[in-house]
């Protein structure tokens, strides 16, 4: 019962349905399944297509632009597990631009072991709000399910029984909503007892054996699982592979001869990209890990004496690293036979990921090009790079090329890093935060000084937004009042004192001490700092009686922290060297003063002997408010109050009921409700900076994913038609 069919290699099925039949006997796809780019298919083409044997995909399932496909319920009725051993851009299930898909219909899908789900731009897709993904995968918060028909609330999702007024499907709570769970109008989502974890359960709720994953035909029996939580061996699910078996592809046990066959098949074939499998830590794996080399007699990985060389030959002589995924392909490489192009625009935990994957590279035979890598601040992730040979050069005879890297501030820490560039020149243009001094240091260390021609290192577009001053200015005097700060700093004179044009004092309010110089500056001239130009002081010939330059900052807010720094303004010299000085950013708080008046006082009497008084804090506290002073004075009673006969029948009880005044800390809600009362004629509030930033990040993230998808999916046709089992992307 367990995996009744064959184990098939990963498949990329595109253009038409002919290759889809290769799935016919597959129980497990060891790899990924991509079905994509079928523009001529119609719904009737899928009517009789079904692959009921398919139980598990070890990597990911990707569906992209398959026309005519309306549901997966008949195509993959028994798909139970997607393991996500290797992911597509962090996703194990990707449904993207499926123009006719009306429902997912994967009603037996019980577990996505690793990775999350991306379902995007499917304008007919419903039955998404009825799926409780938390029952299928752990990292629900990483799911990205947007721009589907489901978003527009146009879906009339009806679970089985609903039309007859019954609730046949389990209901679970998500975001506080109690919703029936189903995949289609005829298939409920199976929800097992929480005690079963991800093992699955029978129809009546008895847990499957703890070695099962997703489902089983009988409870409590490791031979009756539909899929295995750990490893599969001879019709049974096991926690670990016993000797003489080895763990293979994270899901099954294989014997030595199986691993050996894979090794020799690859060795004897001329095919690029196949793996000569080896044995390490009871696993049959594609290659020895870093620090190990293969013993050819028994395929075992043995520790290297000293560093292990691992030469990586790049197809077509070069490789572009544009994501963590592409960097992973070079994991463990120590020598790159070819050239590297780094073009990284964004990503998570980048420095650590790049170091983990590229940090062992010691030598590049060609050139290294860093191009439009907005996400990079430093190249120190190339921790061991010692040699760029320059055997092949970028056009113009460059072996190191850095162009348009908006945030690159440091190449390497040259006090700790040696780099030799055997042949070729350096090219540096449009690296606005990279100081020329850093580039000149590289010339010296790498042995390329004197090779560069005049325009190879742009004097005006490198470091032009950076703080490249050599000397540190120190503040010598700071005095504060509630609205002023008096500053003085140590005098600074360049070698030719006439070069000093003055000082620029930068300041801004800074509630937190996390400000950097370039905060709030952009390419369009925005600047969040207030800048004051200050003339240089009179120069005295006696160094001991030098005037300390300074400035009195006026009109400041009381009890407010300001970030302040000062830098010199010096003439630009053509000898590639700019003198200057700059202070660190300091934080100075103005003194407290009297607060403004408390706002919106309200007094209400709630009994014959009490008055409740409430107010909002002052708009300008101008300090830490420790207490309020409340003054009251008894007023003379109105004589009418005494003369009135309170037993007169015509008197009405006061109609106003006492309700406590609003809470002082919630002024925003108070203001909001005032607007809301105006019969719905209110404007939507302008978006906050953080909302705008979030939307920008979101749209950038979407673009990055689409770029990645297109790069992976659109591959040039190969002239030969042979596709091997391990070819990751047949065209």
């Amino acid at each position: 019962h367990l995996y009744p069919g064959e184990v098939c290699p990963g498949m990329d099925i595109r253009n038409n349905l002919t290759r889809l039949h290769e799935l016919e006997n597959c129980s497990v796809i060891e790899g990924h399944l991509q079905i994509l780019l079928m523009f001529k298919t119609r719904p009737e083409d899928f009517r009789d297509l079904s692959f009921p044997k398919l139980i598990m995909i070890t990597d990911y399932l990707l569906l992209f632009r398959v026309y005519g496909l309306e549901s997966l319920k008949d195509l993959f009725p028994n798909l139970t597990v997607i393991r996500g051993s290797r992911l597509f851009f962090n996703y194990a299930l990707v449904i993207f631009e499926m123009v006719h898909l009306k429902e997912l219909g994967l009603y037996n899908l019980m577990n996505i072991t690793r990775g999350s789900v991306r379902i995007e731009k499917n304008n007919e897709l419903c039955y998404l709000a009825t799926i409780d993904w938390s029952r299928i995968l752990d990292s629900v918060e990483d799911n990205y399910i947007v721009l589907n028909k489901d978003d527009n609330e146009e879906c009339g999702d009806i679970c089985p029984g609903t039309a007859k007024g019954k609730t046949n499907c389990p209901a679970t709570v998500i975001n506080g909503q109690f919703v029936e769970r189903c995949w289609t109008h005829s298939h409920c989502q199976k929800v097992c007892p929480t005690i079963c974890k991800s093992h699955g359960c029978t129809a009546e709720g008895l847990c499957c054996h703890s070695e099962c994953l997703g489902n089983c035909s009988q409870p409590d029996d490791p031979t009756k699982c539909v899929a295995c939580r750990n490893f599969y061996l001879d019709g049974r699910c096991v926690e670990t592979c016993p000797p003489p078996y080895y763990h293979f592809q994270d899901w099954r046990c294989v014997n030595f001869s199986f691993c050996q066959d894979l090794h020799h098949k690859c060795k004897n074939s001329r095919r690029q990209g196949c793996h000569q499998y080896v044995i390490h830590n009871n696993k049959c794996i594609p290659e020895c890990p870093s620090g190990y080399t293969m013993n050819s007699s028994n395929l075992l990985c043995t520790p290297c004496l000293g560093p292990c060389p691992k030469v990586c030959h790049l197809l077509e002589g070069e490789k572009t690293i544009d994501s963590v995924t592409s960097a992973q392909e070079l994991r463990g490489c120590t020598v790159i036979n070819g050239s590297l192009i780094i073009n990284i625009r964004g990503g998570n935990n980048l420095a650590a990921e790049l170091e983990a994957n590229l940090g062992l590279i010691e030598e590049i035979s060609g050139y290294l090009k860093i191009r439009r890598s907005y996400a990079l601040v430093s190249l120190s992730f190339f921790r061991k790079l010692r040699l760029i040979r320059g055997e092949t050069l970028e056009i113009g005879n460059y072996s190191f090329y850095a162009l348009d890297n908006q945030n690159l501030r440091q190449l390497w820490d040259w006090s700790k890093h040696n780099l030799t560039i055997t042949q070729g020149k350096l090219f540096f243009h449009y690296n606005p935060k990279l100081c020329l001094s850093e580039i000149h240091k590289m010339e010296e260390v790498s042995g390329t000084k004197g090779r560069q021609e005049r325009n190879d290192i742009a004097l005006k577009t490198n470091g032009d937004q950076a703080s490249c001053e050599n000397e540190l200015l120190k503040f010598s005097y700071i005095r504060t009042s509630f609205d002023k700060i008096l500053l003085r700093w140590e005098p600074y004179w360049p070698p030719d004192f006439r070069d000093l044009l003055g000082f620029m004092l930068f300041y801004k309010e800074a509630p937190y001490q996390n400000v950097t110089e370039f905060d709030g500056q952009d390419a369009c001239g925005s600047n969040s700092w207030t800048v004051v130009d200050i003339d240089p002081p009179l120069r005295s010939n006696d160094p001991k009686s030098q005037n300390h330059p300074g400035w009195l900052m006026r009109g400041l807010k009381p009890w407010t922290q300001y970030a302040i720094f000062v830098k010199t303004l010096v003439t630009f010299s053509d000898e590639r060297r700019t003198y200057g000085a700059k202070s660190d950013i300091i934080y100075v708080q103005t003194d407290a003063t009297n607060p403004s008046v408390p706002l919106d006082p309200i007094s209400v009497s709630n009994s014959s002997s009490q008055i409740i008084l409430k107010w909002k804090p002052p708009s300008d506290p101008n300090g830490n408010i420790t207490h309020y002073l409340v003054f009251w004075e008894r007023q003379a009673e109105d004589s009418e109050l005494f003369e009135l006969d309170y037993c007169l029948k015509g008197l009405k009880l006061p109609s106003r009921t006492w309700s406590p005044p609003f809470e002082s800390e919630d002024s925003q809600k108070h203001n909001q409700s005032e607007y809301e009362d105006s019969a719905g004629e209110c404007c939507s509030c302008p978006k906050t900076d953080s909302q705008i930033l979030k939307e920008l990040e979101e749209s950038s993230f979407r673009k990055t994913f689409e770029d990645y998808l297109h790069n992976v999916v659109f591959v040039p046709r190969k002239t030969s038609s042979g596709t091997g089992a391990e070819d990751p992307r047949p065209s």
């Epitope: 389990p170 007892p193 005690i195 709720g205 008895l206 847990c207």
Partner: antibody
Framework: QVQLVESGGGLVQPGGSLRLSCAAS????????MSWVRQAPGKGLEWVSA????????YYADSVKGRFTISRDNSKNTLYLQMNSLRAEDTAVYYC??????????????WGQGTLVTVSS | AIQLTQSPSSLSASVGDRVTISCRAS??????LNWYQQKPGKAPNLLIY???SLQSGVPSRFSGSGSGTDFTLTIAGLQPEDFATYYC?????????FGGGTKLEIK
């Protein structure tokens, strides 16, 4: 047919200990999870503890965690409940019950006749 | 822990009556609920498992329904031997919990 017979109940002082046993017959004992459920005089049922068929997994109600220990001897077809630091509120009839399968699924069928534990000074 | 609230806590009925006992869970337990019958001085007996499946040997006048948080035990045509206390019990998550019981008495 399946039979479960509890023993070991009796009177014990607060802070004292007691060990209950449940002798099973009529089924393959090691293939089934077992549970203890108690019922205070005139009150409802309260699940106390469960153990898987192999004895590898144990589960407890919060009210007894750290004081009671469930165990089994599959060679003797016997289930045990070691009760320490007993309190007056532990006074109840203690039933042992067989589960439907080897994992503790919480299906109690059948039950033993019960044994009374009285905690009093 | 999941709380189960049974209602009513006691109920009087006559032979031949149709009675329903309700059990409400503090959170969704899908259909993972059992019903037991207990007669005085005796151990409980499993009547209904997984909300609606009849345990073998139990008369067909007993039936169970419901899912999510609301469940019902129905006895269609009470017999003299049905006067007892009835308990619901969830097996969705640890710790397993029982309802407070419903005592069914002869009117």
């Amino acid at each position: 047919q399946v039979q479960l017979v509890e023993s070991g109940g009796g009177l014990v002082q607060p802070g004292g200990s007691l060990r209950l046993s449940c002798a099973a017959s009529g089924f393959t004992f090691s293939s089934y999870a077992m549970s203890w459920v108690r019922q205070a005089p005139g009150k409802g049922l309260e699940w106390v503890s469960a153990i898987s068929g192999s004895g590898g997994s144990t589960y407890y109600a919060d009210s007894v965690k750290g004081r009671f220990t469930i165990s089994r001897d599959n060679s003797k077809n016997t289930l045990y409940l070691q009760m320490n630091s007993l309190r007056a509120e532990d006074t109840a009839v203690y039933y042992c019950a067989k589960d439907r399968v080897g994992a503790a699924n919480g299906w109690f069928d059948p039950w033993g006749q019960g044994t009374l534990v009285t905690v009093s000074s | 822990a999941i709380q189960l609230t049974q209602s009513p806590s006691s109920l009087s009925a006559s032979v031949g009556d149709r009675v329903t006992i309700s059990c409400r869970a503090s959170q969704s337990i899908t259909s993972y609920l059992n019903w037991y019958q207990q007669k005085p001085g005796k151990a409980p007996n499993l009547l209904i498992y997984a909300a609606s499946s009849l345990q073998s040997g139990v008369p067909s006048r007993f039936s169970g329904s419901g899912s999510g948080t609301d469940f019902t035990l129905t006895i269609a045509g009470l017999q003299p031997e049905d006067f007892a206390t009835y308990y619901c019990q969830q097996f969705d998550s640890y710790p397993f919990t029982f309802g407070g019981g419903t005592k069914l008495e002869i009117k």
